[in-house]
């Protein structure tokens, strides 16, 4: 081949260095963004997926840009603007990252964005047959109207005192508020 650095074989600003052995008369040290034995190939820098969190990669030749999705920022979209870092979920809740916004997975009995609100266990009117629902530290309790029993006042009490349950739970009286 006989090509040497004197022939200017390195393209795109590549630096030519004379080879250390007869089989390689020169070596091209390519600038960022180019590759190949003569720096003739442009590197598709976006193929390395440098933009995190779903950011769009733009190879501008002289530079690489990331267009970030909502909720993310930084040269490589690496900063979650609303992530769990430094953000606490109250009342035993755990923080879950995703989609550019943090979310709290709340412990039983709590709700809201940061688990600061007490959940309303009575919202769905769980106490049947006129039962009165109370929010309770253990969840909810139903005060059953006379003639009904069960955790949700779902079982009628028969006139003879028996209920529609196969067997009445121990220690419960018909009409008792149930946990």
């Amino acid at each position: 081949s006989g090509v040497t650095c004197a022939d200017g074989p390195c393209f795109n600003g590549g630096l030519c260095v004379g080879g250390a052995d007869p089989d390689s008369a020169y070596i091209c040290h390519c600038p960022p963004g180019f590759q190949g034995s003569n720096c003739e190939k442009r590197v598709d820098r976006c193929s390395l997926q440098p933009c995190r969190n779903g950011g769009l990669c733009l190879d501008l030749g002289h530079a690489l840009r990331c267009r970030c999705r909502a909720g993310f920022a930084g040269p490589r979209c690496e900063h979650d603007l609303d992530d769990c870092a430094g953000r606490a979920c109250a009342n035993g809740g755990t923080c879950v990252e995703g989609g550019g916004a943090h979310r709290c997975s709340c412990a039983l009995g709590f709700g809201g964005r940061d688990c600061r609100e007490r959940a309303d266990p009575c919202a769905a009117r769980p106490c049947a047959h006129g039962g009165r629902c109370y929010a309770h530290f253990s969840g909810l309790v139903c005060a059953c109207a006379p003639g009904y029993m069960g955790a949700r006042c779902e079982f009628p009490v028969h006139p003879d005192g028996a209920s529609a349950l196969p067997a009445a739970p121990p220690g419960l009286r018909p009409g008792d508020p149930q946990r």
């Epitope: 609100e117 007490r118 309303d120 009575c122 009117r125 005060a143 006379p146």
Partner: antibody, heavy 123, light 111 residues
Framework: QEQLVESGGGLVQPEGSLTLTCTAS?????????MCWVRQAPGKGLEWIAC????????TDYANWAKGRFSISKTSSTTVTLQMTSLTVADTATYFC???????????????WGPGTLVTVSS | QVLTQTPSPVSAAVGGTVTISCQAS????????LAWYQQKPGQPPKLLIY???SLASGVPSRFKGSGAGTQFTLTISDLECDDAATYYC????????????FGGGTEVVVK
Amino acid sequence: QEQLVESGGGLVQPEGSLTLTCTASGFSFSSSGYMCWVRQAPGKGLEWIACISGGSSGDTDYANWAKGRFSISKTSSTTVTLQMTSLTVADTATYFCARDVYIDSTIFNFNLWGPGTLVTVSS
Amino acid sequence: QVLTQTPSPVSAAVGGTVTISCQASQSVYNNNNLAWYQQKPGQPPKLLIYAASSLASGVPSRFKGSGAGTQFTLTISDLECDDAATYYCQGTYYSSGWYSTFGGGTEVVVK
């Protein structure tokens, strides 16, 4: 510190209307049982009026005599109102807001009261 | 439903005992859903006893509730001047809906 404060009382003419407000601090209604109104005519005994669920169900209970003229509603997680219409001299009383909690399988336990607001119906 | 309290007023000396009766025209909910309140002039009522015989938080054991169904009693022993007040019983009922009624009140005078 858990507290209830009533407001909106005052002088109103017979057949007039008035809305009383109960505001809670130190707790939110959704974490408690029911919020209720009780009244007391000057020198007389206590008279239960109505209750509303502290949660979002909005379930209500009324004394028979109060149905139609009195309306209880929850306007936020810390405020409850009592709307009173067609007022008569007999409605002159101090109106108390009270919290009804479930304790040991019993209900209508008024364990927290406001100081009351005086409503005077007079021409 | 009517709750009748007797007697009124009731009077006793410091250190003495008073007993107030509350008679319901029909059984209260669960036979025990009856509460007692203490009210002093210019103040809201204060819950003393719930579930007929259970002492509310912070209430001294000198106050004792008893009874079931339609007949209930509040006993105050070792009377103190601070016990001078009006006492109300309150019953809960269910009949096509929940409701509550108060007794007429009993004034306790401490001599």
